[in-house]
């Protein structure tokens, strides 16, 4: 008589997570009498997947009625597949006995589960950096299968090339994770810039997933300072202005010093926003020129976003004409009350 064979026709089957899988198995003979069992894996650690005689296998059903006379098809149907179901499934024929004796195994069918990657999460540097410096952004996505995946980086629509990507684990697994780190050189115009991490995978049907991060969270554009004076209508007053230009973020503290001594401190409030996302601000003083004696140096000192202060000084210029307007008895502070423009 012909020796019994257990035939598993498919070497591999691939399904998408959430779908059902059919694993085919037929035997070539009804003899000897005995059950068929399905296992995932081989050896002593193999896992029983289906046993007609006993056990509770809520997601596994037989394709045909295995109790039907002359049935030689022992294919099974597994519903609601998850990545954890991946593995090699063996259809095994046993000879009836006490206990049943394993007789023959099929060659195995490898079930691979296609699973979508999670939405990419992009995280930026923990501290801000200034233009011309390089910052790193990290993109992570998890839970996908198969392992093949494509990740691209863009800055304002332009593809970046300076990045490193790792997919883990290196070997076969039920699902995988990707982590990529891109290096971006900042420019002064990057307040409105955005980096995009784009992930393409077979499960996404050509519609890649994207994660974004704003460079506004990563950049600090330090201000430029300019101090100048303008005459006022009143002949014994001049306007000294500190123009703070092109800074980001908004957090700014300005201190006026008279000959090195703190005169007043202001926090930037009413700011003007530039097209590139940076800000301008100006603070000004009304200076009583008659209170001037041996020359006054006014210093505008700016502390931006908690960084060390930068300053610009201006030696007060008092014309001979202005000096003539002052009587010998004139006194009072050099600096008159001010208001920001």
């Amino acid at each position: 008589e012909e020796e019994l064979q257990v035939i598993q026709p498919e070497k591999s089957v691939s399904v998408t997570a959430g779908e059902s899988a059919t694993l085919n198995c037929t035997v070539t003979s009804l003899i000897p009498v005995g059950p068929i069992q399905w296992f995932r894996g081989a050896g002593p650690g193999r896992e029983l997947i289906y046993n007609l005689k006993e056990g509770h296998f809520p997601r596994v059903t037989t394709v045909l009625d295995p109790t039907k006379r002359n049935n030689m098809d022992f294919s099974i149907h597994i519903s609601n597949i998850t990545p954890a179901d991946a593995g090699t499934y063996y259809c095994v024929k046993f000879r009836k006995g006490s206990p049943d004796v394993e007789l023959k195994s099929g060659a195995g069918t490898e079930l691979s589960v296609r699973a979508k990657p999670s939405a990419p999460v992009v995280s930026g540097p923990t501290a801000r950096a200034t233009p011309e410096h390089t910052v790193s952004f990290t993109c992570e996505s998890h839970g996908f299968s198969p392992r093949d995946i494509t990740l691209k980086w863009f800055k304002n629509g332009n593809e970046l090339s300076d990045f490193q990507t790792n997919v883990d684990p290196a070997g076969k697994s039920v699902s995988y994770s990707i982590r990529s780190t891109a290096r971006v050189v900042l420019t002064r115009r990057d307040v409105h810039s955005q980096v995009i991490c784009e992930v393409a995978h077979v499960t996404l049907q050509g519609d890649p997933l994207r994660g974004t991060a704003n460079l506004s969270e990563a950049i600090r554009v330090p201000p430029t300072l300019e101090v100048f004076q303008r005459p006022m209508r009143a002949e014994n007053q001049v306007n000294v202005t500190c123009q703070v230009r092109k800074f980001y973020p908004q957090r700014l503290l300005l201190t006026w010093l008279e000959n090195g001594n703190v005169s007043q401190t202001e926090t930037a409030s009413t700011l003007t926003e530039n097209k590139d996302g940076t800000y301008n601000w100006r603070s000004w003083l009304l200076v009583n020129t008659c209170a001037h004696r041996d020359g006054v140096v006014l210093t505008c000192q700016v502390e931006h976003d908690g960084q060390p202060a930068v300053s610009k000084s201006h030696a007060l210029e008092v014309s001979a004409h202005q000096k003539e307007q002052c009587s010998d008895t004139t006194s009072g502070p050099v600096l008159a009350p001010t208001a920001p423009l």
Partner: antibody, heavy 122, light 112 residues
Framework: QVQLQESGPGLVKPSETLSLTCTVS????????WSWIRQPPGKGLEWIGF???????FYQSSLKSRVTISLDTSKNQFSLKMTSVTAADTAVYYC????????????????WGQGTTVTVSS | DIVMTQSPLSLPVTPGEPASISCRSS???????????LDWYLQRPGQSPQLLIY???SRASGVPDRFSGSGSGTDFTLKISRVEAEDVGVFYC?????????FGQGTKVEIK
């Protein structure tokens, strides 16, 4: 091809815990058994235990109370912990891959690490 | 536990000549599926063991065809058709039918 590399301390004090890690490179953890085998000086091979990729573990009965084998698939590593060591645990410790195909038995220990010498001494 | 017994424990050999090692198991390693769960290993001096034969008679990848395995049930033999100098070391048989995996005591092969 697949390579295995053992790492861990070469000297352990009596009554302390021996910890070894085996890193799998160039291949997959899936579908194999991952074994620890030791060889005392001048003696033969003694199987300690193994772990299947699905996490199921099997141990030498005489060592079972002292041994734990674990698997970290994200790092492609598996580990051995042996508590309350004595001088009798001095040996070269090998990590190895055991193949499984189809039936209940196994198909040969086909990949071995180079071995790491562990001495138990105060 | 399945006990594996090898003989001889020491085997002086002449290069170019055949050699044979015997291994006996305390219970049958022939499983109901017809597969024999018996493996042979060679441990060269200062090296890790390497798999030579699995399933009683199948040569592992890269193993020269001068090595062959035979036998079934409880009695097994490893034959080397023509011994070469690189074959010196300790040969072990091992069973993979059930846990614990067990090995023979080893047969030390050395050049005469």
């Amino acid at each position: 091809q697949v390579q295995l590399q053992e790492s861990g301390p070469g000297l352990v004090k009596p009554s302390e815990t021996l910890s070894l890690t085996c890193t799998v490179s160039g291949g997959s953890i899936r579908d194999y058994y991952w074994s620890w085998i030791r060889q005392p000086p001048g003696k033969g091979l003694e199987w300690i235990g193994f772990i299947y990729y699905n996490g199921r573990t099997f141990y030498q009965s005489s060592l079972k109370s002292r041994v734990t084998i674990s698997l970290d698939t994200s790092k492609n590593q598996f580990s051995l912990k042996m508590t309350s060591v004595t001088a009798a645990d001095t040996a070269v410790y090998y990590c190895a891959r055991v193949r499984a195909y189809s039936g209940i038995g196994l198909d040969g220990t086909d990949v071995w690490g180079q071995g790491t010498t562990v001495t138990v001494s105060s | 536990d399945i006990v594996m017994t090898q003989s001889p424990l020491s085997l002086p050999v002449t290069p170019g000549e055949p050699a044979s090692i015997s291994c006996r198991s305390s219970q049958s390693l022939l499983y109901s599926t017809g597969y024999t769960y018996l493996d042979w290993y060679l441990q060269r001096p200062g090296q890790s063991p390497q798999l030579l034969i699995y399933g009683g008679s199948s040569r592992a990848s890269g193993v020269p065809d001068r090595f062959s395995g035979s036998g079934s049930g409880t009695d097994f033999t490893l034959k080397i058709s023509r011994v070469e100098a690189e074959d010196v070391g300790v040969f072990y048989c091992g069973q993979a039918l059930q846990t614990p995996l067990t090995f023979g005591q080893g047969t030390k092969v050395e050049i005469k």
